[in-house]
Amino acid sequence: LYFSRDAYWEKLYVDQPAGTPLLYVHALRDAPEEVPSFRLGQHLYGTYRTRLHENNWICIQEDTGLLYLNRSLDRSSWEKLSGRNRGFPLLTVYLKVFLSPTSLREGECQWPGCARVYFSFFNTSFPACTSLKPRELCFPETRPSFRIRENRPPGTFHQFRLLPVQFLCPNISVAYRLLEGEGLPFRCAPDSLEVSTRWALDREQREKYELVAVCTVHAGAREEVVMVPFPVTVYDEDDSAPTFPAGVDTASAVVEFKRKEDTVVATLRVFDADVVPASGELVRRYTSTLLPGDTWTQQTFRVEHWPNETSVQANGSFVRATVHDYRLVLNRNLSISENRTMQLAVLVNDSDFQGPGAGVLLLHFNVSVLPVSLHLPSSYSLSVSRRARRFAQIGKVCVENCQAFSGINVQYELHSSGANCSTLGVVTSAEDTSGILFVNDTKALRRPKCAELHYMVVATNHQTSRQAQAQLLVTVEGLYVAEEAGCPLSCAVSKRRPECEECGGLGSPTGRCEWRQGDGKGITRNFSTCSPSTKTCPDGHCDVVETQDINICPQDCLRGSIVGGHEPGEPRGIKAGYGTCNCFPEEEKCFCEPEDIQDPLCDELCREQKLISEEDLGGEQKLISEEDLHHHHHH
């Protein structure tokens, strides 16, 4: 048995006479032989679930579910109740109604075995019938909504009449009907005004019925019509077995360059027309088991279950359903020497499914793990300026397919043939397994005899000791010009183009900083700034060379504070800035300001933008929104 609603509403007035019927509660059956028996909780409750008093006023007919006043609620009783409501005005009280024998003790009131009946209290006597508006004669203030379980026997779930009105205003005639399309499974009995289902409902065919209740009031010569929504929601049960969309029960996959733990190798999708079990229970009740294979397979793979709600069309309306993605995932990094083929089976069990048929499916994954060979081009040829500053990036080396690698560790080394001309260093980029070549020793660059630098590039996978080698020829070009004395170590310090281009800074391949002119569009990723090389800085990413020294590219790498209009980078740097951004790396501070100081208001907002009151904000910066900035520009 279950209630067709979780809450009911009615009005209570002072001195309403004993015997006044209040409302019906309705229970629906889960099985044909069930007979409901209703029981009221012992107490009345007020604001914030405050237990006010033992319920001495309202009774229920156990077999019909009719609630009625056993004795009149007089003013003194009401004042006694109000005094216990934690000082709040007593506007609403509620009772708990239980379905016996579902719950024998009064505890938490949870649907389906308990419903709450709320009474809005009016500290006046029942109004004169002639003063009641049609809306008040027809429907409760709170619109009801109904919940009906699918596949259950049909039954009565609502009674339209407002019983106190009918009892106290017998001369007013009120008629009801349901507006519904042809063939809908609901019926409103003209005599009893009871609404019932004609047959068992199927949620997979229709989940929501948006009906309309029509009430016609006859008072003397006048007739008025009131219409309200009458929504019914069909509740799901696990009556659908899982299936394969389009019958696809097998997925094939090749593991080659992506060998990292947590890589998704293949995915198979299972469809279930149900939306139960609910999300909290789903993973426990909808199980997937990688069937025993060899130890290597069990250690290497795992299956991840990713359920998702979807909607499907049924009989012209959309109903919810569930798609379950089963992902075959690498449980560990795979060595580049690994080479094997296997078939894996996964058993999926919808353990709540009651039949007919089985709630079990078998998923098949065919997986080939291919070995990876390390290959480098036979040779590389690069040039570098004699004026290049330390940490200037001059090129990349990359084993074949390195951009596609994940979970494959490749370390690059440079072996110089001329000991005194060892100018370059190499670091492995974590992003694409390439090696970034950078200037490590500027003194060697300046030696006249170091006009050509010869290196051997060695790429090694330490796990397998596999290696690849290539020649690297670096031509040193141009004349050395001593850098300006007193220039900042970081290009990022400069905030105007002339001062930027007259100095060099760490990471500069040409020995001169480069100015990046922004697009001037509010808080933008393309802000103006001074950089050692606009190819690499700023690009929204603190690369492995830039991490070597904060002075190279604080715009990408700063972990400190940014003052002015900006959006911080994740996890560091400036993702977007307003106007020109310059930085003081040794202070972990950057500033983003308008480029042309023409608009005094904007100047005030951005240039002098600091902390509001440091104590108030705990030192957090107050950021200006892009909208603010646009607004100031337009005006």
């Epitope: 900042p488 170590l489 400069s494 904060i550 002015g564 040794e586 202070e587 972990e588 500033f591 440091e614």
Partner: antibody
Framework: EVQLVESGGGLVQPGGSLRLSCSVS????????MRWVRQAPGKGLEWVSG????????YYADSVRGRVTISRDNSKNTLDLQMTNLRAEDTAVYYC??????????????WGQGTLVTVSS | DIQMTQSPSSLSASVGDRVTITCRAS??????LNWYLQRPGKAPKLLVY???SLQSGVPSRFSGRGSGTDFTLTISSLQPEDFATYYC?????????FGQGTKLEIK
């Protein structure tokens, strides 16, 4: 009210060591870079050392590099300058200063009263 | 390193006078320049930052100008408490050097 109070100065022999401290209050210490600036008797101001708000970045004047270490404890609101291998030319009043920033670099908006270090045999 | 040179080294003036002190950088420092005042036996006090921005609480008779290599600090009408030593300091490139100071004395 912002306050910076230096301590730890005194007379020390050449080659000796000294630890200067600066206790601060009245602002959120961890949000600000700090500096040590010194002034030899009757002379001008000389920037000695700096440290970023987090303490992660430190830097020194060439005249003291390798002989001094700047550090800070943000939980105790203190700034320290450890000086070793002291020379006669290190004799000066040492000031700690709070660094504020504009986009045109640092400026020192609050200073301590100074502590005198005398290096003499 | 950037050298900062102030002129004059010392200057005599009277209360109410208008006084200008000059600071020259050995290379362009754009507007990365600050001015401080120091009274005898006291710590320096910030007057002007970023060449021309007046620090809050500093009287408006003080003003700074300049860009590149040449900068000036002007006191429009000297007050008795203004007789002190003035220092410029560049914040463009480490080490962040100070000028040698200008001593302003009562005539």
């Amino acid at each position: 009210e912002v306050q910076l109070v230096e301590s730890g100065g005194g007379l020390v022999q050449p080659g000796g060591s000294l630890r200067l401290s600066c206790s601060v209050s009245g602002f959120i210490f961890k949000n600000y870079a700090m500096r040590w600036v010194r002034q030899a008797p009757g002379k001008g101001l000389e920037w000695v050392s700096g440290i970023s708000g987090s303490g992660g970045i430190t830097y020194y004047a060439d005249s003291v590099r390798g002989r001094v270490t700047i550090s800070r404890d943000n939980s105790k609101n203190t700034l320290d300058l450890q000086m070793t291998n002291l020379r006669a030319e290190d004799t000066a009043v040492y000031y700690c200063a709070k660094a504020e920033y504009s986009s045109s670099g640092a400026y020192f908006d609050y200073w301590g009263q100074g502590t005198l270090v005398t290096v003499s045999s | 390193d950037i050298q900062m040179t102030q002129s004059p080294s010392s200057l005599s003036a009277s209360v109410g006078d208008r006084v200008t002190i000059t600071c020259r950088a050995s290379q362009s420092i754009h507007n990365y320049l600050n001015w401080y005042l120091q009274r005898p036996g006291k710590a320096p006090k910030l007057l002007v930052y970023a060449a021309s921005s007046l620090q809050s609480g500093v009287p408006s008779r003080f003003s700074g100008r300049g860009s590149g290599t040449d900068f000036t600090l002007t006191i429009s009408s000297l007050q008795p408490e203004d007789f002190a030593t003035y220092y410029c300091q560049q914040s463009y490139s480490a080490p962040y050097s100070f000028g040698q100071g200008t001593k302003l004395e009562i005539k």
